[in-house]
């Protein structure tokens, strides 16, 4: 078999809200994924397993199960929304995120996916991970995901 | 439906003070910030400041610290600027805008006219 | 403070033409960190306050008519008109919404030749 290629392309959007009373703050961040599939039979897309981290600490998981099916040397862009809570132990970062002083609020989370492919009974999994500057002060739409050069730190080794 | 209503036309002398409003409804007041923007006739738009109803924190321009004043009461849903040491330099239609927090300028008032002449 | 430019100051068209109007930046207002420019773009009819057409630099509000596109980065925008309506007219402002204290052009009127 050839390799499936997985490649994480960044942020599509981050909607904010926000709880005063609890000091919480709420980020639903859809990212885009292109899975590539490199040999001459189809791939089943199982399952995307996500989650997100803020200063280690995980902030926000999802799953996505039965996604699609991908032909022979076919790529798909699949984009897949993390809802995440910023709020308890962290909730001094409500603070930063509504500052009335700056307009810029960016914070660093760390994107973390699993990609679940299945082929002829056999399951492979292929993960990735990838740091994203967010602004947690107001929403932001792309009309195209970031592309990777975008991305701020290098994926863990 | 989302409105914010400003009070009517005022007319002063110079070295008053005016306190203008701009009356919220249709969504929940505390949740938005309230700006302020002044628009000298036949010019372009400055920022004065802004206010979070929530908490009262406000962030001005340096160019009105001194000048205006932001305040709001929660119980009316009601912002207010106050403008203070009138000249002529002041005469303006003056705007509230919201924002939902640091998101852009969603939502205008229809302005307030200040006219300050002897 | 962030000064913004805008030409030309004034445009005169005929309907159904297309228009484009520059608005530049004394400082980028590009967030370098999720690579979104926080420029917007506000529409002025005659006798009434501001509307927003467009944030981001190119994401048009909600009920914007698709004639509408915003472009560029950095300290370069543009606004740009593809068929050009009765109802288009009036003045047009950029903003930056990248820093305090939040900074307007002084317009581009567009008027009915």
């Known amino acids: 078999p050839r390799s499936i290629e997985v490649k994480y392309i960044g942020v599509k959007s981050a909607y904010v809200s926000y709880d005063a009373e609890k000091r919480t703050i709420y980020l639903n961040i859809t990212n885009t994924l292109n899975i590539t599939n490199n040999n001459y039979y189809s791939v089943e897309v199982e399952n995307i397993t996500a989650q997100v981290q803020f200063s280690k600490t995980v902030i926000g998981k999802a799953r996505l199960n039965n996604i699609t099916n991908i032909g022979p040397l076919d790529m798909k862009q699949i984009d897949y929304t993390v809802p995440t809570v910023i709020a308890e132990e962290m909730s001094y970062m409500y603070d930063f995120c509504t500052l009335l002083s700056i307009k810029v609020h960016n914070i660093v989370l760390m994107m973390q996916v699993t990609v679940t492919t299945a082929y002829f009974g056999h399951s492979e999994q292929i993960s990735q991970e990838r740091y994203q500057y967010v602004d947690c002060g107001r929403n932001t739409t792309y009309q195209l995901a970031q592309s990777e050069y975008l991305n701020v730190l290098q994926p863990q080794q | 439906e989302v409105q914010l209503q400003q009070s009517g036309p005022v007319l002063v002398k110079p070295g008053a003070s005016v306190k203008m409003s701009c009356k919220a409804s249709?969504?929940?007041?505390?949740?938005?910030?309230i700006h302020w923007v002044k628009q000298s006739h036949g010019r372009s738009l400055e920022w004065i400041g802004v206010i979070s109803p929530y908490n009262d924190n406000t962030n001005y321009n340096q160019k009105f610290k001194g000048k205006a004043t932001l305040t709001v009461d929660k119980s009316s849903s009601t912002a207010y600027m106050e403008l203070n040491s009138l000249t002529s330099e002041d005469s303006a239609v003056y705007y509230c805008?919201?924002?939902?927090?640091?998101?852009?300028?969603?939502?205008w008032g229809q302005g307030t006219t200040l006219t300050v002449s002897s | 403070d962030i000064v913004m430019t805008q030409s030309p100051s004034s445009l005169s068209v005929s309907a159904g033409e297309k228009v484009t109007m520059s608005c530049k930046s004394s400082q980028s207002l590009l967030n370098s960190g999720n690579q979104k420019n926080y420029l917007a773009w506000h529409q002025q009819r005659p006798g009434q306050p501001p509307k927003l057409l467009i944030y981001g630099a190119s994401t048009r509000e909600s009920g914007v008519p698709d004639r509408f596109t915003g472009s560029g980065s950095g300290t370069e925008f543009t606004l740009t008109i593809s068929s050009v309506q009765a109802e288009d007219l009036a003045v047009y402002y950029c903003?930056?919404?990248?820093?305090?204290?939040?900074?307007f052009g002084a317009g581009t009127k567009l008027e009915l030749k």
């Open positions: 903003q930056n919404d990248h820093s305090y204290p939040l900074t």
């Open positions: 805008v919201r924002t939902y927090y640091s998101n852009y300028f969603d939502y």
């Open positions: 249709g969504y929940t007041f505390t949740d938005y910030y």
